[in-house]
């Protein structure tokens, strides 16, 4: 991680890449711990703020503009010799989000996958971006990035991710950048979590009053399992929302979540799924399927749950 | 969104001290740092230095050095300003302003009014 | 010290008026100029950095231009709302220093 002998690691803090208008903590690590240093931008573009100016410990950049985003080096303060400081860090970029209208970003086959599978998320714009970034939240590594492929007037990337280990399992946002300019990124597109399924064991799904019920009749499907399980999610097979909700413990050491489903108008298959909230993205196995069905006349399809949908939230906490 | 959240007003005797908190939220505490500033009645902004909250490295202007020290609290996200031997001339309004080493201050505080009398 | 000198100190506008407030500095400040909106009992409010650019949520009708030591802060067309003091910085070096105001008053 650290540089060589003589070669100080510069490194940013929470990321490198920012968004306009974001503050971003620079930090030079030199023998074995964080000094005076030096500060350099390789354009030699907006560089009045480092002019001969000694930093400590850390820099703190911003509010940025499109002109920080770009390559940096540091050189750690080194008092006995001949210059007084180091050679050069790694190079460290910079990207500046916010530039240009955002690209869309899609998971294939979809953004709930099982442990070991591979995904692919395409980035796409009808801007013509030469590169796409795909970065996820909370990684201070270097965002992927991909050459944009041009069909029909739409740019796009596909990044593979996979095998999918927990690891790799949170939120995505693509970015586009435009030839000329190659770290002043696009706005963000919206947020895609990816989640990961099978890592524990099932729990168990039921209807109240019961699977069959009748129209109009008030359904709640209840999800629960001995394992200490801090949130459920309720899927309905056919739709891209879940309905999450927090466990409660019960009297028997069983943990539960009680999904209200409201008067039943039609039927569907429903799975639930346990997550701890220490990793929202990572999810059990899948229950057995429960099939709940609708006697009567059905009018028109169960109400649309109201939680957020796969697309995002799923990885924020639950608060 | 970004908010800075001052403590209320005060009133001290010559010679007391204070301590003046500043709330951040809606942002990463530690990714910025917190400038002071202080404007006397009918005055203009006087800068009286800044903190960087991610190293909690102070740096104090001239005028400033001795009597005024910034610390912080990273778990509470709080930036706080303490005045020791106070004057009458440094009754004002103390501002927290969210800045870097870049000196901008984008976000401000609402201000707190330290009121020095016998 | 970087000493900013801005003018004027006070100036009446009509609704609609484009209003110029200019700052200079006493050494070369590298474009490292912000502005600032102080209402009355606010604190102040960025409106520019970096000489032009805007802060987020900054309507357009204010524009900020300059290099070297001469900086220009621009109401294209004056509002009631934009009565208020206006201050420069530079942050070019430490310590960060203001110019001494200006008082907009609508007429």
């Known amino acids: 991680l650290m540089g060589g002998q003589d070669k100080p690691f510069l490194s940013a803090r929470p990321s490198t890449v920012v968004p306009r208008g974001g503050h971003v903590a620079l930090q030079c690590h030199y023998r074995r711990g964080f000094n005076n240093f030096m500060l350099y931008k390789e354009d030699r573009s907006h560089v009045p703020i480092f002019h001969g100016r000694i930093f400590q410990e850390s820099f703190i950049m911003g509010p940025v503009t499109p002109a920080h985003a770009g390559t940096y080096r540091c050189r750690g303060s080194r008092p006995h010799s001949l210059t007084g400081w180091s050679a050069p860090s790694n190079p460290l970029v910079i990207m500046v989000t916010g530039n240009h209208r955002k690209p869309s970003l899609l998971a294939h086959p979809g953004p709930l996958l099982k442990s070991g599978e591979t995904v692919i998320l395409q980035c796409w714009s009808d801007v013509m971006f030469e590169h796409f970034f795909l970065h996820r939240e909370g990684i201070s590594e270097d965002p992927s990035r991909l050459v944009g492929q041009i069909h029909d007037g739409v740019s796009k990337a596909n990044f593979s991710i996979g095998p999918l280990m927990p690891v790799l399992a949170g939120t995505y946002r693509c970015y586009g950048s435009v030839p000329h300019s190659p770290y002043q990124l696009s706005a963000p597109s919206d947020p895609l979590d990816i989640v990961i399924t099978g890592l524990y064991e099932k729990p168990s799904l039921s209807a109240q009053p019961g699977p069959t019920v009748q129209a109009g009749e008030n359904v709640t499907l209840s999800c629960s399992s001995w394992s200490s399980y801090d949130i459920y999610h309720l899927s309905r097979e056919g739709e891209a929302h879940e309905r999450r909700l927090r466990a409660v413990p019960k009297v028997n050491r069983t943990f539960q979540a009680d999904f209200p489903l409201g008067p039943a108008t039609h039927g569907g298959t429903y799975r639930c799924f346990g997550s701890f909230r220490a990793l929202p993205c990572v999810w059990s196995n899948s229950s057995d399927p429960l099939l709940v069905s609708v006697t009567g006349n059905p009018s028109s399809s169960w109400p649309s749950p109201t939680e957020p949908s796969s697309k995002s939230g799923i990885c924020r906490h639950l608060h | 969104q970004i908010q800075l959240v001052q403590s209320g007003s005060e009133l001290k005797k010559p010679g007391a001290s204070v301590k003046v908190s500043c709330k951040a939220s809606?942002?990463?505490?530690?990714?910025?740092?917190m400038q002071w500033v202080r404007q006397a009645p009918g005055q203009g902004l006087e800068w009286i230095g800044w903190?960087?909250?991610?190293?909690?490295?102070?740096k104090y202007a001239e005028d400033f050095k001795g009597r005024f020290v910034f610390s912080l609290d990273t778990s509470v996200s709080t930036a706080y300003l303490q005045i020791s031997s106070l004057k009458a001339e440094d009754t004002a309004v103390y501002f927290c302003?969210?800045?870097?080493?870049?000196?901008?201050?984008?976000?401000w505080g609402q201000g707190t009014t330290v009121t020095v009398s016998s | 010290d970087i000493v900013m000198t801005q003018s004027p100190s006070f100036l009446s506008a009509s609704v609609g008026d484009r209003v110029t407030i200019t700052c200079k500095a006493s050494q070369d400040v590298s474009t490292a100029v912000a502005w600032y909106q102080q209402k009355p009992g606010q604190p102040p409010k960025l409106l520019i950095y970096?000489?032009?650019t805007r802060h987020t949520g900054v309507p357009d009708r204010f524009s900020g231009s300059g290099s070297g030591t001469d900086y220009t802060l621009t109401i294209s067309s004056v509002q009631a709302e934009d009565v208020a003091v206006y201050y420069c910085?530079?942050?070019?070096?430490?310590?960060?220093?203001f110019g001494g105001g200006t008082k907009v008053e609508i007429k």
């Open positions: 903190i960087n909250s991610h190293s909690g490295v102070p």
């Open positions: 910085q530079q942050h070019y070096s430490t310590p960060w220093t």
């Open positions: 809606g942002y990463t505490f530690t990714t910025a740092g």
């Open positions: 970096w000489t032009s």
């Open positions: 302003a969210r800045g870097g080493d870049e000196g901008v201050m984008d976000y």
